[in-house]
């Protein structure tokens, strides 16, 4: 840690005679510089030079060849590396007065005559005299204004809005400044900052727009940080809205965005007069071109029970916004002709949800359904097969005689989705067939009996059982069953010999 530089003359303030020369020496443990009252354009008679000495210290000399009223002010010697833009200069100070009987007040720039006050805060009206002994009064439209005066700074106080004039008398001669205008600015102790990005997803070539609004505050400095900032890719705008209340709207526009413009867009607002800071951020993504992603919440083969109500939900991520349509068996779904409805809702900026709703599922609702999402850059689809599940039912149970051989075939036709399984049962004691225990399942490997199954179409099946020889009356039961239910029917098979006897009788 370096100790503060030192100044010769070692005084807080010094009065220098008009048109005389003076010099200030600064000593430091590192390289030192001077800050002085005049701007660089006015400082032609200020010379700064480095001086060698044996002390091992760095020495910088400020020399004024002909002192004038404009040289009145604070001279600060500081270490070069300690100066930062935001902080007040840290160093050693000396205040120089150059009394001039013809110039009572230190000349000021035009901006110094605008005094900005925050609400009811105190402010300084910076009329500084060239002579510390000069008496000064402050006046406004109502007369003399009571305020404390310091010849190094000016009048300090709480001032109402309006013009103020400083008045001084030097050797019987009256001097007046031009009016200082006190202007009140709205400022709050907390920053109310809002960020808005109507969109956060763009594609190449589009224009990114982000706004930050500061409410009830006029003393604000707002900085943007964003991916293209360093390369000047962004145009800012400030709009001041006064009604119904003060609102500063800062807009950042990035025309013809590219993928490189993706990233965090941040606005940081700082109250110009207080150490109050607020920051907001939004993440923007720029895609080379538009895109579509389809994410179904169900599989490619779906089943629905007859008369059931069922919803099929598909999540879609897309930009630009997609057109979403549904097809059945490659034909556009005509909703008003069926008890099927579709809808699309926007969940988030680029997220959509589409639903296909079956109100009361019917057999004819089975088929291939396709959702198609498309925008100017992409087309995506997803197809699934829907089966309406129908309980099994027996359509027909008939027998077929083989003539003289005595063989008989029983055919059982059943329908349902999924396709029913057919089982055969037999009851050999015709008198006891009312009792379930009299029925036995017909196994495939029984000699003289052949069972076979044929699919007739997607939902119809035919089962056949062939008895090589029926020697006594038996009952045959066809049992058709699938996931949703079972149905059975029975048939009596009469032996051919018995049949002929019946015929004779």
């Amino acid at each position: 840690q370096l100790s503060l530089p030192s100044i010769l003359p070692n005084e807080n303030e010094k009065v220098v005679q008009l048109n005389s020369s003076f010099s200030l020496r600064c000593f430091g443990e590192s390289e030192v510089s001077w800050q002085y009252p005049m701007s660089e354009e006015e400082s032609s008679d200020v010379e700064i030079r480095n001086e060698e000495n044996n002390s091992g210290l760095f020495v910088t000399v400020l020399e004024v060849s002909s002192a004038s009223a404009a040289h009145t002010g604070l001279y600060t010697c500081y270490y070069n590396h300690t100066q930062t833009e935001e902080n007040e200069l840290e160093g050693r100070h000396i205040y120089i007065y150059v009394p001039d009987p013809d110039v009572a007040f230190v000349p000021l720039g035009m901006t110094d005559y605008l005094v900005i006050v925050e609400d009811d805060d105190s402010a300084i009206i910076p009329c500084r005299t060239t002579d510390p002994e000069t008496p000064v009064t402050l006046h406004n439209s109502e007369g003399v204004v009571p305020a404390s005066y310091d010849s190094r700074q000016g009048f300090n106080g709480t001032f109402t809005v309006g013009p103020y004039i400083c008045e001084a008398t030097v050797k019987g001669k009256k001097f007046q400044t031009i009016p200082f205008n006190v202007y009140a600015l709205k400022a709050t102790s907390e920053l109310d900052l809002e960020m808005e990005a109507l969109k956060t997803v763009y594609k190449s070539g589009e224009t990114i727009v982000v706004t930050c609004a500061v409410f009830n505050n006029e003393v604000v400095d707002l900085q943007w940080t964003y991916p293209g900032e360093v390369k000047g890719k962004g145009i800012t705008m400030l709009e001041e809205i006064k009604v119904p209340s003060i609102k500063l709207v800062y807009t950042l526009t990035v025309p013809e965005a590219t993928v490189k413009d993706s990233g965090d867009y941040e606005c940081a607002a700082r109250q110009a007069t207080r150490e109050v800071k607020e920051m907001k951020k939004v993440t923007i993504s720029v895609h080379e071109k538009g895109f579509i992603e389809i994410k179904p919440t169900f599989s490619q083969l779906e089943a629905v029970n007859l008369h059931e109500v069922k919803h099929f939900v598909v999540e879609v991520r897309a930009y630009p916004p997609p057109r979403i349509s549904w097809l059945k068996n490659n034909l556009t779904l005509i909703e008003n002709l069926t008890e099927i409805t579709t809808d699309v809702e926007k969940i988030q900026e680029i997220r959509y949800r589409s639903k296909l709703k079956l109100i009361r599922a019917k057999e004819e609702d089975s088929g291939h359904y396709t959702i198609v999402a498309q925008n100017e850059d992409a087309v995506k689809s997803y197809t699934f097969e829907l089966l309406t599940q129908v309980p099994s039912s027996i359509l027909d149970l008939v027998d077929d005689h083989h003539g003289s051989t005595g063989g008989q075939t029983v055919r059982c036709t059943a329908e349902g989705t999924p396709l029913p399984d057919i089982e055969w049962m037999i009851c050999k004691d015709i008198k006891k067939c009312n009792n379930e225990t009299s029925w036995t399942i017909l196994a495939n490997n029984v000699s003289n009996i052949i069972t076979e199954i044929h699919s007739r179409d997607r939902s119809t099946v035919e089962g056949r059982v062939t008895f090589a020889k029926v020697e006594e009356t038996i009952a045959v039961r066809c049992l058709a069953k699938n996931l949703l239910g079972a149905e059975n029917r029975e048939l009596k098979l009469v032996a051919p010999t018995l049949r002929s006897e019946l015929t004779v009788a």
Partner: antibody
Amino acid sequence: EVQLVESGGGLVQPGGSLRLSCAASGFTFSSYSMNWVRQAPGKGLEWVSFISGSSSTMYYADSVKGRFTISRDNAKNSLYLQMNSLRDEDTAVYYCARLRYFDWSYAFDIWGQGTMVTVSS
Amino acid sequence: DIQMTQSPSSVSTSVGDRVTITCRASQGIRSWLAWYQQRPGKAPKLLIYAASSLQNGVPSRFSGSGSGTDFTLTISSLQPEDFATYFCQQATSFPFTFGPGTKVDIN
């Protein structure tokens, strides 16, 4: 050849309306933001309005806000400026200009030849 | 709004002379400045963008420099076709603003 051609200027009474057009050719019109810039006789250049490539964003100079409307038709490669409630101070040559981002800065790289608008009673 | 000022407002000079035009912005605009040339009765033409980058097809006798608030356009050796008005323009903030122009005419 890249070019912009303005049309639609003329003499109009104060309070009247006029619609300027700018036909673009030789470049992908929809890929660029476009602007109107005007120049009063013997005076400097004044930016009037901006429109982004897809018409999603428009900005105006305070002097024309609420009276002028910028628009474009990318299918026709055309830029428009609808001017209502015209005033004497709107008298100027109106240029359409393409805004282009070069690495490190924006600039108006292509200008039309201009169309004269005279507002006078 | 960012105010742009130019100096001088006009300059009388001869072919072969070196001409320097300065442009000042009311607040820092980094290097986001463009220079345009406008011949009488013609549309402006872009000479320099980003304070110092020469636009394609513009002769190398034109050069630009500066950043922040102070910028310079230099014509190293004036040619007859260079007699025109020159404008600077800031491209960092809406409304885009131009300098009032500097007229370069024959002495």
